[in-house]
Interface confidence: medium
């Protein structure tokens, strides 16, 4: 099965990918696992999320958004990376709370993108993701009150693309982190539509495999996912067009940043 281009996508651009496999369509493979992965979309020239079945597929599949961008976007590392001191919030500030696998009780802090504040949470002690700070001050300094730099006109600043919690490195290096800049990606806080359009794709609780679409507020697009037939949430549409009609209207057109496509 392959991810199709969005209804609203333009024709295939002239940008040449770094590798031939970056031009392949997303292939979720024949297996039935539901693994959040990323692929490079030749039509949008962006790395986007898709659901991988767990076996076969092709090389246009990455565990993290960052890995996809580094591999498939020409010049990404040279031109799209700048230090956190001069950037907006690092991407890990927008990762969901992840207490990890263990059952310890460690008081930690994370940035909550809904409330725009750093909040306390209980960390189990192992694994998890980098939205995990030992002190409230550290969390605030990195995610709540980052140093802003002026952004070019007609460019939407990167502030909220969803990444996989697997890309974790030592917390002590957080002040030296390089932050990817991804133009043309609307931020979640620029969204004023229906609240369920901000919810992550939820495959539900049953065992069916139904093709559905969910709105990804990070990319401003509707993506396909497999729905198991029961449970889940309201960010679940039978067609991409319905999904776009329901959720795309909530994007704010911001004068200082240009029109969000």
């Amino acid at each position: 099965l392959s991810e199709e281009a969005d209804d609203t996508d333009s024709e295939l651009g002239s940008m040449k990918p770094l590798h031939t496999f970056c031009a392949m369509k997303a292939d979720d493979g024949p297996c039935k696992a539901m693994i959040r992965s990323y692929f490079f979309n030749m039509y949008t020239h962006q790395c986007e999320e898709f659901i991988y079945g767990g076996c076969e597929g092709n090389e246009n599949r990455f565990d993290t958004l960052e890995e996809c961008k580094k591999t498939c976007i020409p010049g990404y590392e040279k031109t799209a990376v700048k230090a956190a001191s001069g950037a907006e919030r690092p991407d890990f500030c927008f990762l969901e709370e992840d207490p990890g696998l263990c059952r310890g009780y460690m008081k930690r802090y994370l940035y909550n993108n809904q409330t725009k504040q750093c909040e306390r949470f209980v960390y189990g002690g192992c694994l998890g993701n980098r939205n995990n700070f030992e002190t409230l001050d550290e969390c605030k300094k990195i995610c709540e009150n980052p140093v802003h730099s002026p952004s070019p006109v007609n460019e939407v600043q990167m502030s909220d693309y969803v990444t996989d919690g697997n890309t974790v490195t030592d917390r002590s290096t957080v002040n030296n982190i390089v932050v990817p800049q991804s133009p043309k990606v609307p931020r979640r806080r620029d969204y004023r539509g229906r609240p369920w359009c901000l919810q992550p794709a939820d495959s539900g609780l049953c065992k069916a495999s139904e093709r559905r679409f969910y709105y990804n507020s990070a990319t401003g697009k509707c993506h396909r996912f497999n729905y198991t037939g029961c449970g889940g949430n309201n960010n679940n549409f039978t067609t991409r067009r319905r999904c776009l009609r329901s959720c795309k209207t909530g994007l704010i057109k911001n004068k200082s940043k240009g029109v969000v496509k």
Partner: antibody, heavy 117, light 110 residues
Amino acid sequence: QVQLVESGGGLVQPGGSLRLSCAASGFTFNSYAMTWVRQAPGKGLEWVSAIKSDGSNTYYADSVKGRFTISRDNSKNTLYLQMNSLRAEDTAVYYCARNDSGWFDVWGQGTLVTVSS
Amino acid sequence: DIALTQPASVSGSPGQSITISCTGTSSDLGGFNTVSWYQQHPGKAPKLMIYSVSSRPSGVSNRFSGSKSGNTASLTISGLQAEDEADYYCQSYDLNNLVFGGGTKLTVLG
């Protein structure tokens, strides 16, 4: 009794793919995080990947990130490890283990993966 | 990231006590009860001997005990027996990894 049985190992050429399975029995599979650990011939143990009980989060060692994919099917009490772009240094016995809060209290017997041309 | 260092080998005679150390390079090891120990006989799967620094799973002999002081965890085996000859691994974790020490080969002399 509580048991884990791995399968799917074998000989594969560099760059090839292999899918390991781990069948669990004797315990409530969907209540436990699960882990893959490997051991190269004559070497020590190396953690490879872990997955939460409901499959919602997955974790990988740097050495396999982007090449290996862990998944599980709780309806079948089975854990999987899809290994792509295999390298000679991936040659090892692969164990699946039950992850009880960061330690591994139940282990399978292991399955040997040999990557060689 | 956390890294764990063990001695390559230790030895002892039957009836003696031996201690295997496991030193962490990260403060995580010193600040949290994160250490477990595994025994592995040649050709066999590892077996959990100690978890949460000093807890013993059911079925493991009380000759095995664990402790921790600062950044160093220790496994002590008292009343050494021939069947204790095996490789022993310490293991811990942090935000990024579940980590094993390099392993210690225990030889029971005589």
